[in-house]
């Protein structure tokens, strides 16, 4: 199915307009700013998200990197160019002609240039970290139920197989999740790493994407998990491509 | 504690239709998807499908795909799996199991039902 | 499909005796080191019970003379010390892929 029939909405995907004019009267749903159809049974793509969100502030994130080539979505919310298929096209540019390339979660991997640069393939984030800081707790979370609830919350409530959730790595009070996702792994129902990361960054803010559920409850064996702080850390099958003078 | 309870044995004839509940307790429903694994008389264990408690969506066995319908009532925490144009190899004790936290394991299951399909 | 080749499919063992059933799987069950293979009990007339999973992890619950190894293809499940309420028919299972599989099983007898 694609959309909740019985009062056709999306429950995936609140930025969403629908009405029942599918085959047969179906409730068919598509996304604000793209007016693109979604699959209401998954995640909507980041990209149709980003689109369809207009405006917020821009979250600027400044942390120690784990890797030389771990890129951090510095550059904040832009209104991106979306495949067909719902996917950040490789190359994004905005008004000014100002010009740059992304990876498949959108995260800018290149110096910006002008209207001549180009982006020969959209690169694929295999590799994302999720750096959590949890508030004070009466005693540390431990680590098995952690890793067990973690795992579970991606698998139901993002559909992500737990396959894809390589470790959850615990050194109270910093929780980090690592997601990966080899294109070669990737079958072709299996939900996207780098959607289902996005979909948990706005739980985790209260900002849920979900369609008139509650905001995201996280418990690990009744004691709430009340994250503080979130970092977000991509890592792609080819390295960036930046130049020196960005690095000093 | 856990508990999944199902519904009583079925006899159906060739061509029919039967449905078996699954009653969840102890836990939150939509936190847990429900999967359906069959077994044969004298035989092993073969997985159906599981649905999706949360979203009530469902992802078959190809093998059972356009003959089986699996459905949740979440006001009952209640699974149900349907399978429809019964045959005499049908005939099983039907399973109902409940996803495990992390690993996809079945970590509790129903009683089971058994359906017997005879002319 | 994930095919799964449990051996043997019957055993004779007696009380106190080490038994190891093997799980040979067509394709690895292996992900970033996270083994997508499980390891149940069933005794005639009942639903299964979950004693293994993720290859080694013991179930909550369940005694220590269970035991699990193996990672990618092959996997061994293990009873240290077989004890008379343990007869009954072992399956492994694998959850690395739609449809999810299960050996054949292993009907263990008390000699």
């Known amino acids: 199915h694609t959309a909740a029939q019985d009062n056709c909405t999306c429950p995936t995907n609140k930025m969403t307009v629908c009405s029942p004019d599918g085959p047969g009267g179906r409730c068919q749903c598509r996304a604000l700013g793209s007016g693109m159809a979604v699959d209401c049974s998954t995640l909507t793509s980041k990209c149709l998200l980003l689109k369809a969100r207009m405006s917020a502030p821009k979250n600027a994130r400044t942390l120690v990197r784990p890797s030389e080539h771990a890129l951090v979505d510095n550059d904040g919310l832009y209104d991106p160019d979306c495949d067909p298929e719902g996917r950040f096209k490789a190359r994004q540019c905005n008004q000014t002609s100002v010009c740059w390339c992304v990876n498949s979660v959108g995260v800018r991997r290149t110096d910006k240039g002008d209207l001549s640069l180009r982006c020969d393939e959209l690169v694929r984030t295999h590799h994302i970290l999720i750096d959590l800081r949890h508030r004070p707790t009466a005693g540390a979370f431990n680590h098995s139920d952690l890793d067990a609830e973690l795992r579970r919350l991606f698998r139901e409530r993002y559909r992500l197989h737990p396959k894809f959730v390589a470790a959850v790595h615990y050194e109270q009070p910093t929780i980090q999740i690592e997601l990966r996702q080899n294109t070669s792994q990737k079958a072709a129902g299996d939900v996207d790493i780098g959607d289902a990361a996005y979909y948990f960054e706005r739980d985790i803010k209260g900002e849920s994407l979900f369609q008139g559920r509650g905001g995201l409850d996280l418990r690990v064996r009744g004691e709430p998990l009340q994250v503080e702080r979130t970092l977000i850390y991509y890592l792609d099958e080819i390295p960036p491509k930046f130049s020196m003078k960005r690095l000093t | 504690q856990v508990q999944l309870v199902q519904s009583g044995a079925e006899v159906k004839k060739p061509g029919a239709s039967v449905k078996v509940s699954c009653k969840a307790s102890?836990?939150?429903?939509?936190?847990?998807?429900i999967n359906w694994v069959r077994q044969a008389p004298g035989q092993g264990l073969e997985w159906m499908g599981v649905i999706s408690t949360y979203y009530g969506d469902a992802s078959y066995n190809q093998k059972f795909k356009g003959r089986v319908t699996m459905t949740t009532d979440t006001s009952t925490s209640t699974a149900y799996m349907e399978l429809r144009s019964l045959r005499s190899d049908d005939t099983a004790v039907y399973y109902c199991?409940?996803?495990?936290?992390?690993?996809?394991?079945?970590?509790?299951w129903g009683q089971g039902t058994m359906v017997t399909v005879s002319s | 499909d994930i095919q799964m080749t449990q051996s043997p499919s019957s055993l004779s063992a007696s009380v106190g005796d080490r038994v190891t059933i093997t799980c040979r799987v067509s394709?690895?069950?292996?992900?970033?080191?996270?083994?997508?293979m499980h390891w149940y009990q069933q005794k005639p007339g009942k639903a299964p019970k979950l004693l293994i999973y993720r290859a080694s992890n013991l179930e909550s619950g369940v005694p220590s003379r269970f035991s699990g190894s193996g990672s990618g293809t092959d996997f061994t499940f293990t009873i240290s010390s077989l004890q008379p309420e343990d007869i009954a028919t072992y399956y492994c299972q694998q959850s690395y892929e739609d449809p999810y599989t299960f050996g054949g099983g292993t009907k263990l007898e008390i000699k």
């Open positions: 102890g836990y939150t429903f939509t936190d847990y998807s």
């Open positions: 394709e690895s069950v292996d992900s970033y080191g996270n083994n997508f």
């Open positions: 199991a409940r996803y495990g936290d992390g690993y996809n394991q079945f970590d509790y």
